[in-house]
Interface confidence: low
């Protein structure tokens, strides 16, 4: 009797890992959102990027939801979110509207529920491109660790749009749950 | 009987706590590379950094492999990945090549299965290190949640690998699993 | 007899995922720190920031503890830091000692066992913030993966204090534990 | 503007190397391509450089083709050369680092792969 | 690798000729046409799928985003005449060939 149920025992916790591993490991929320440079808005005011790509190259979701240019938190928990975006310019794209630029990335919570929307981050810097260059760069990375509750949404602004590079590995955003709220 | 039972489920339950602890938390593949200055390129051209130090001061690593300056993964996963890149030129180094510079990192990701290179994340800024100043000083930092399979290499290539800042405080990138592939 | 094991050992592995899932999930350290403004030094040295907010808008902490300008570790493992730090200067606020600036960052770890500071991240840049521009912005982020030991205490150095952006999207700085230490 | 150099006659399974200058630019802080057409047929990309470094290939070009370049030249060595690699070479020259749209392109040069 | 269509096309002074190119993945905006004629190198007249180059005529015209691209030159004068080629500008990894294979415009 006590072999026969030390077996079921062995067996019970070999499939309890197995699930224990998969609801633990394969549950947990990410995102990593890429820029949709086919809809970039014009212009060198500050804008929400609403056009991200969510499935292609290096760009995936999982547990979370895309919608609308934001991304939406479908399961409570602790956050760690972060944001690298490229600003370019060439002399074969035309002059710039003026040399002294400022250009910043926010990233910014709304909360459906009490309809406000809130700074979490903010990076960038003033920048001075002068024409006696024929090309410039600059790159901003912010990340923190926040608690996002379900139904609450993330979304990207930038100053300068016209200017941000296009490529995958230049400007996106992302997420991942590191942990449960208490 | 039933307490007996009682008694050994609670002894099997305890060790299988300790085993999946273990199991869970000590698997984790990480790795934090510190830059080797003692053999840093010369020159102003874009280049792979292959000397970094994997086991001394801050350096680590576990569950990855670092070989012929690429870092290797070992396990399947979604990964954090980041990179710290800081550039200095002081007056006293003698006069720079250029004062217009192009001072950029690209963490690229090579497979292989498929001998293909791809750029994950890249960062950096176009500067002008004018004579005026005694001492210039620039850092990059990129970060980003990537799908990584086993043998896949992740590097690092940089511009102007002449003016990296050789302290581990300083030049370094990382990896941190986060979550398996469903 | 056998029916009666079965159910309590569903009963019993049932409230032991409800334990691990609390010990894993809850128990993990992290803290995310804003800038307190009310408390910025002046001047253009490098100084330690001692002022932080750990309790209200997106500051917060969990099995870490604040005390005295740092950020002191209760739970050994390796956690990721980060910190993202926003300078900012506005013609209204008078002149600038100087146009040429070195703008810092140093996150440090100081044990208490063994008393030394060693820097663990450093980030910035030089800036020439010239008077034809009546407004200038730049923000630093570092991010890193480190073991850190019951007891040691993370703190922030920046030059420049008295340019700080005192938003709390701005100037903060945290960490979250990622993994135990084997 | 920029100016391919180095064309010529070469023998089946042979070396060639040719070379591209600028003016007007400096070829160091560019992007550089090299392309290809065989008479009568289409552009043919073959590889790209950074500024100081890193090339990188078309596919059908990796292990024959070579691009590297100096301060003042951006080169293209050829090997193991056979009449279909008769062809004119271009050399081009990026909108920016990391932008692969060609804005200057060169004359070309005859590269003719004969017995 | 980027199919462009068609081959070859004549078109009338004044009439309007369209060529499409086809990516075999998306590569956003991420495209560019060339104008080569015989003899010569080609010219860049569009980047990033729909904006003119410096000094290109506002008769070339280009659109599409995804894999679907089309260039139209509209008003077509006899210095129309010459091959177009396709670039895609999206990635140069694992390429073999990022032009299209060209198509003739032949002006009668």
């Known amino acids: 009797g006590s072999q026969h149920i030390r077996a079921e025992k062995a067996m019970v916790d070999g499939s309890w890992l197995d699930l224990a591993k998969r609801s633990k490991l394969e549950a947990q929320p990410f995102a990593h959102l890429t820029i949709n440079a086919t809809d970039i808005p014009s212009g060198s005011h500050k804008v929400s990027l609403s056009s991200w790509y969510h499935d292609r190259g290096w760009a995936k979701i999982s547990n979370m939801t895309f919608s609308n240019g934001k991304l939406i938190v479908n399961q409570d928990g602790f956050y760690y979110l972060y944001a690298n975006i490229c600003f370019r310019h060439h002399e074969t794209s035309g002059d710039l509207a003026t040399e002294y630029l400022q250009l910043m990335v926010y990233v910014t919570k709304t909360s459906i529920k009490i309809p406000s929307s809130h700074t979490l981050m903010k990076g960038g810097s003033t920048k001075y491109w002068s024409g006696n260059s024929e090309f410039h760069f600059y790159s901003i990375n912010v990340g923190g660790f926040f608690k996002l509750r379900s139904g609450e949404e993330i979304s990207i602004e930038v100053s300068n749009p016209s200017l941000l590079d296009p490529d995958q590995d230049a400007t996106y955003f992302g997420a991942f749950k590191v942990r449960d709220i208490d | 009987g039933s307490q007996h039972i009682r008694a050994e489920k609670a002894m099997v339950d305890g060790s299988w706590l300790d085993l999946a602890k273990r199991s869970k938390l000590e698997a984790q593949p990480f790795a934090h590379l510190t830059i080797n200055a003692t053999d840093i390129p010369s020159g102003s051209h874009k280049v792979s950094l292959s000397s970094w130090y994997h086991d001394r001061g801050w350096a680590k690593i576990s569950n990855m492999t670092f070989s012929n300056g690429k870092l290797i993964v070992n396990q399947d996963g979604f990964y954090y990945l980041y990179a710290n890149i800081c550039f200095r030129h002081h007056e006293t180094s003698g006069d720079l090549a250029t004062e217009y510079l192009q001072l950029m990192v690209y963490v690229t990701k090579t497979s292989i299965k498929i001998p293909s290179s791809h750029t994950l994340m890249k960062g950096g800024s176009t500067k002008y290190w004018s004579g005026n100043s005694e001492f210039h000083f620039y850092s990059i930092n990129v970060g980003g949640f990537f799908k990584l399979r086993s043998g896949e290499e992740i590097s690092i290539e940089v511009s102007n690998p002449s003016l990296l800042d050789p302290d581990q405080d300083a030049t370094y990138f990382g990896a941190f699993k986060v979550r398996d592939i469903d | 007899g056998s029916q009666h094991i079965r159910a309590e050992k569903a009963m019993v592995d049932g409230s032991w995922l409800d334990l691990a899932k609390r010990s894993k999930l809850e128990a993990q350290p992290f803290a995310h720190l804003t800038i307190n403004a009310t408390d910025i030094p002046s001047g253009s040295h490098k100084v330690s920031l001692s002022s932080w907010y750990h309790d209200r808008g997106w500051a917060k902490i969990s099995n870490m503890t604040f005390s005295n300008g740092k950020l002191i570790v209760n739970q050994d493992g390796f956690y990721y830091l980060y910190a993202n730090i926003c300078f900012r200067h506005h013609e209204t606020s008078g002149d600038l000692a100087t146009e040429y600036l070195q703008l810092m960052v140093y996150v440090t770890k100081t044990s208490i066992k063994i008393p030394s500071s060693h820097t663990l991240m450093k980030g910035g840049s030089t800036k020439y913030w010239s008077g034809n521009s009546e407004f200038h912005f730049y923000s630093i982020n570092v991010g890193g993966f480190f073991k850190l030991r019951s007891g040691e205490e993370i703190s922030i150095e920046v030059s420049n204090p008295s340019l700080l952006d005192p938003d709390q999207d701005a100037t903060y700085f945290g960490a979250f534990k990622v993994r135990d230490i084997d | 503007s920029v100016k391919e150099s180095g064309g010529g006659l070469v023998t089946p399974g042979g070396t060639l190397t040719l070379t591209c200058t600028a003016s007007?630019?400096?070829?160091?802080?560019?992007?550089m391509s090299w392309v290809r057409q065989a008479p009568g047929k289409g552009l043919e990309w073959i590889g790209y450089?950074?500024?100081?470094?890193s090339p990188y290939y078309a596919n059908w070009a990796k292990g024959r083709f070579t691009i590297s370049r100096t301060s003042t030249t951006v080169d293209l060595k050829m090997t193991s050369l056979t009449t279909e690699d008769t062809a004119t070479y271009f050399c081009?020259?990026?909108?920016?680092?990391?932008?692969?749209?060609?804005?200057?392109w060169g004359p070309g040069t005859l590269v003719t792969v004969s017995l | 690798d980027m199919i462009q269509t068609p081959a070859s096309v004549e078109v009338a002074v004044g009439g309007t000729v369209t060529i499409n190119c086809q990516a075999s993945q998306s590569i956003g905006s991420n495209l560019a046409w060339y104008q080569q004629k015989p003899g010569q190198p080609p010219k860049l007249l569009i980047y990033?799928?729909?904006t003119l180059a410096s000094g290109v005529p506002s008769r070339f015209k280009g659109s599409g985003s995804g894999t679907q691209f089309t260039f139209t030159i509209s008003d077509v004068e006899c210095t129309a005449a010459a091959t177009y080629y396709c670039?895609?500008?999206?990635?140069?990894?694992?390429?073999?060939?990022?032009f299209g294979g060209g198509t003739e415009v032949v002006v009668k």
């Open positions: 670039q895609q500008a999206y990635s140069i990894s694992n390429v073999d060939n990022a």
């Open positions: 990033g799928a729909s």
């Open positions: 007007g630019f400096s070829l160091s802080n560019n992007a």
């Open positions: 450089i950074y500024p100081g470094g």
């Open positions: 081009a020259r990026h909108v920016s680092d990391g932008g692969w749209y060609l804005y200057i």
